[in-house]
């Protein structure tokens, strides 16, 4: 029950996270005009990954897409790439995790396959979340750098009298959405990986009990991890080093390919 809850919650959290990553990627407010220490402007500028917009006091908003690809800064291209990779991985992860959900029955799919799929989606969510966090952080760093560069020469005097105010940009709402969404996707992925450990059948359908002797004992258990390779079943015996007697009802903590989570 706890495993199903963990898996379900992981899926929901990841779903919200990926929706947030998509929203952040599409949002226009990645950077917004810094209004601090500025004259009260009737023209408000903000920029996204795909277009820049201007909102006027009249209520009119005009957006222009970045129709060039080669003319854009490499950093912006990198951010775009990271966000898209994050979305693609997240979407695939969601697709895989739907079939991996314990509460959904698909034919005669074994628990081992579901465990494998849960782990795969979990890893995908983790990478997706990291991509989003990295993308947003790279953009934020770019903003901070540009902000201080423009602050250094914000007022460039022309003949002493005329001033040119350089537009400075600060963090937009999309950055915060991206950070939160990336974090949620990451958390969801971790939860899926945790759920995977509980999903993996450690035993065959009878309870195997290992007894420990006074010396350093080796207990052989028939039908170890079925989910050890690929999506197929694995009936090879696995050598387990254990100090006490346990049943498959108890939490297992034997070294396995799932233990790095």
């Amino acid at each position: 029950m706890a495993v199903t809850a963990c898996q379900g919650l992981g899926f929901v959290v990841s779903l919200i996270g990926i929706a947030g990553i998509i929203a952040a990627t599409c949002m226009d407010q990645w950077s917004t005009q810094d209004l601090y220490n500025n004259p009260v402007t009737a023209v408000f500028n903000y920029q996204g990954l795909w277009r820049s917009c201007v909102r006027e006091s009249s209520g009119f908003t005009e957006c222009r897409g970045y129709f060039t690809l080669l003319g854009l800064p490499a950093m912006l291209q990198a951010v775009r790439a990271l966000m898209i990779v994050g979305i693609v991985l997240g979407a695939i992860g969601l697709l895989v995790s739907i079939f991996a959900l314990k509460c959904i029955r698909i034919g005669s799919m074994e628990d081992s396959a579901k465990a494998n799929m849960t782990l795969t989606s979990g890893i995908m969510f983790i990478v997706s979340g990291l991509c989003a966090i990295a993308g947003v952080s790279v953009f934020a760093n770019m903003l901070v750098t540009n902000f201080w560069m423009s602050t250094a020469n914000m007022y460039t005097g022309m003949g002493g009298m005329v001033q040119t105010v350089q537009t400075r940009y600060t963090f937009g709402a999309a950055l915060f959405v991206g950070w939160v969404a990336g974090g949620l996707t990451l958390i969801g992925g971790v939860m899926m990986c945790i759920a995977c450990r509980g999903l993996a059948p450690e035993e065959t359908n009878y309870k195997a009990v290992s007894y420990h002797a006074s010396g350093h004992s080796v207990a052989y258990k028939p039908g170890g991890f079925k989910a050890s390779t690929g999506f197929g079943s694995n009936t090879k015996n696995k050598k387990i080093y254990d100090g006490g007697a346990r049943t498959e009802d108890e939490v297992q903590s034997y070294p396995s390919k799932h233990d790095y989570v």
Epitope: V54, E56, S57, S58
Partner: antibody
Framework: EVKLVESGGGLVKPGGSLKLSCAGS????????MSWVRQTPEKRLEWVAT???????YYLDSVKGRFTISRDNAKNTLYLQMNSLRSEDTALYYC?????????????WGQGTSVTVSS | DIVMTQSPTSLSVSAGEKVTMTCKSS????????????LAWYQEKPGQPPKLLIY???TRESGVPDRFTGSGSGTDFTLTISSVQAEDLAVYYC?????????FGAGTKLEL
């Protein structure tokens, strides 16, 4: 046809109050940013206040705290409540509309209402 | 506040003449976000409210004759009337519509 009709002007003593109204017709009033502009006896134009669609309000520094701009979209009316009036507030007050695609420029003006502050 | 300086203050012209008036702002009215200048020109005839002629420094308002041309960028702007007609005799004002307060120039009076 777009029409802006101001009313409420008159003669008032210094320190007195007056409320100007501007009735808009021929356009969707709630979709436009509205402003008050005054023309002094010396024929200088002076922007007074602006109220945006999102009800952001901006005032000329010399009228801040004394004048209040407001709008009633249901009645298609713009208001300017003027308190603590001074002699320098004497002017012809125009109600203006900021055009949606005119880069914040005022595309329509009323005929104006005269305000005289004198003892 | 942004100071708008118009010159000359008055201009005596004959019909058919080309007229140029200038407007200088104390701060750039150019917006890098959309590469537009936020300056408007108005015409005020005696006994009438001002009428919008030019917005965005160079775009003619609909219904405005093409003899009126706005130009300039940043801080220096110009209004040109290619061939003055009798009905053009009025006061012309420039206005900053980029920053609050929306300041006007003192005006240029066009007279015969």
């Amino acid at each position: 046809e777009v029409k802006l009709v101001e009313s409420g002007g008159g003669l008032v003593k210094p320190g007195g109050s007056l409320k100007l109204s501007c009735a808009g017709s021929g356009f969707t009033f709630s979709s436009y940013t509205m402003s008050w502009v005054r023309q002094t006896p010396e024929k200088r134009l002076e922007w007074v206040a602006t109220i945006t669609i999102g009800v952001n309000i901006y005032y000329l520094d010399s009228v801040k705290g004394r004048f209040t701009i407001s709008r009633d979209n249901a009645k298609n009316t713009l208001y300017l409540q003027m308190n603590s009036l001074r002699s320098e507030d004497t002017a012809l007050y125009y109600c203006t509309r900021l055009g949606q695609t005119q880069r914040n420029a005022m595309d329509y003006w009323g005929q104006g209402t005269s305000v005289t502050v004198s003892s | 506040d942004i100071v708008m300086t118009q010159s000359p203050t008055s201009l005596s012209v004959s019909a058919g003449e080309k007229v140029t008036m200038t407007c200088k702002s104390s701060q750039s009215l150019f917006n890098s976000g959309n590469q537009k200048n936020y300056l408007a020109w108005y015409q005020e005839k005696p006994g009438q409210p001002p009428k919008l002629l030019i917005y965005g420094a160079s775009t003619r308002e609909s219904g405005v004759p093409d003899r009126f041309t706005g130009s300039g960028s940043g801080t220096d702007f110009t209004l040109t009337i290619s061939s003055v007609q009798a009905e053009d005799l009025a006061v012309y004002y420039c206005q900053n519509v980029h920053f609050y307060p929306f300041t006007f120039g003192a005006g240029t009076k066009l007279e015969l």
